[in-house]
């Protein structure tokens, strides 16, 4: 079966946008006006995985780049990275588990839980200009809530 991908942008609950910081890192900061064009556009693919009404498995690639957010162990800690893939083979319906996030909608916010590491979430810091990372706590200092803006292809 073909995998369907839709383009979108993300903002954290403090309205920080996500931008590239070097070739393999994302950071979160407040953008306004024309600077909004700097924000990363994701290609979100609906992939195979455990699904419910509030939880949808997705993969988050960078639009028109062969880079996907993935979750791996580094020094025994679940870590978020941008991983380069072969564009001939991705995206695909059966993505490897490290690429899969459970998109969970709670009230008017979205969370992205790692399928590989349950209870670890795509997170941003309260501080400006800090890397996007995989965090193991919800409801603390770090931000795990996002809104999504779909955009035309």
């Amino acid at each position: 079966a073909p995998v369907r991908s839709l383009n979108c942008t993300l903002r954290d609950s403090q309205q920080k946008s996500l931008v590239m910081s070097g070739p393999y890192e994302l950071k979160a900061l407040h953008l306004q006006g024309q600077d909004m064009e700097q924000q990363v556009v994701f290609s979100m693919s609906f992939v195979q995985g455990e699904e419910s009404n509030d939880k949808i498995p997705v993969a988050l690639g960078l639009k028109e780049k062969n880079l996907y957010l993935s979750c791996v162990l580094k020094d025994d800690k679940p870590t978020l990275q941008l991983e380069s893939v072969d564009p001939k083979n991705y995206p695909k319906k059966k993505m490897e588990k490290r690429f899969v996030f459970n998109k969970i909608e709670i009230n008017n916010k979205l969370e992205f839980e790692s399928a590989q590491f349950p209870n670890w979430y795509i997170s941003t810091s309260q501080a400006e200009n800090m890397p996007v990372f995989l965090g193991g706590t919800k409801g603390g200092q770090d931000i795990t809530d996002f809104t999504m803006q779909f955009v035309s292809s």
Epitope: L6, D54, I56, F150, S153
Partner: antibody, heavy 119, light 107 residues
Framework: EVQLVESGGGLVQPGGSLRLSCAAS????????MSWVRQAPGKGLEWVAY????????YFPDTVKGRFTISRDNAKNTLYLQMNSLRAEDTAMYYC????????????WGQGTLVTVSS | DIQMTQSPSSLSASVGDRVTITCRTS??????LTWYQQKPGKAPQLLVY???TLADGVPSRFSGSGSGTQFTLTISSLQPEDFANYYC?????????FGQGTKVEIK
Amino acid sequence: EVQLVESGGGLVQPGGSLRLSCAASGFDFSRYDMSWVRQAPGKGLEWVAYISSGGGSTYFPDTVKGRFTISRDNAKNTLYLQMNSLRAEDTAMYYCARQNKKLTWFDYWGQGTLVTVSS
Amino acid sequence: DIQMTQSPSSLSASVGDRVTITCRTSGNIHNYLTWYQQKPGKAPQLLVYNAKTLADGVPSRFSGSGSGTQFTLTISSLQPEDFANYYCQHFWSLPFTFGQGTKVEIK
């Protein structure tokens, strides 16, 4: 029985604003994504706004982006469309529609509310 | 954006006729296509989704087929209540655009 009832349409001058409402009943509103679709007189259908079940995701095509906002109140089972900087070309029947979970087809539609933008 | 081209834009047919409406897309949308029926002064109603799955309550005289870039909606034996406008819509990539419609009139 699924029911969607739109209201709030009317005559508005170019540059003006209008807020449409859609009252939903007969299903668990908080579990469904919703959209607004419009139809200019004698013309075809155009999808103009989308919101996910909890309100965390939205979409607007380029024709209305920056002018229209969509919101919902799940406690009141109501969907809204705030339309600002209205233009003559926004004149249309506006339908609210219930949408399948993963941004797909519209399985139920309201009867529509007419918006006329004219001086 | 994926462009949707419906043909014919209108047709005249008699009760009992077999009617076929075609929808072509500018890009491959696999089976991500829907058909709606709209009667004058009424809201559209879902007929077919995923190119060929009949929506609940839709009579079996309606059928959908096709994949990729070419799709058809067929009414095997036209009934008086079938005189209406028909629209296709894709939901493969944003924006999900509609065809311009096909008006089915009484001959």
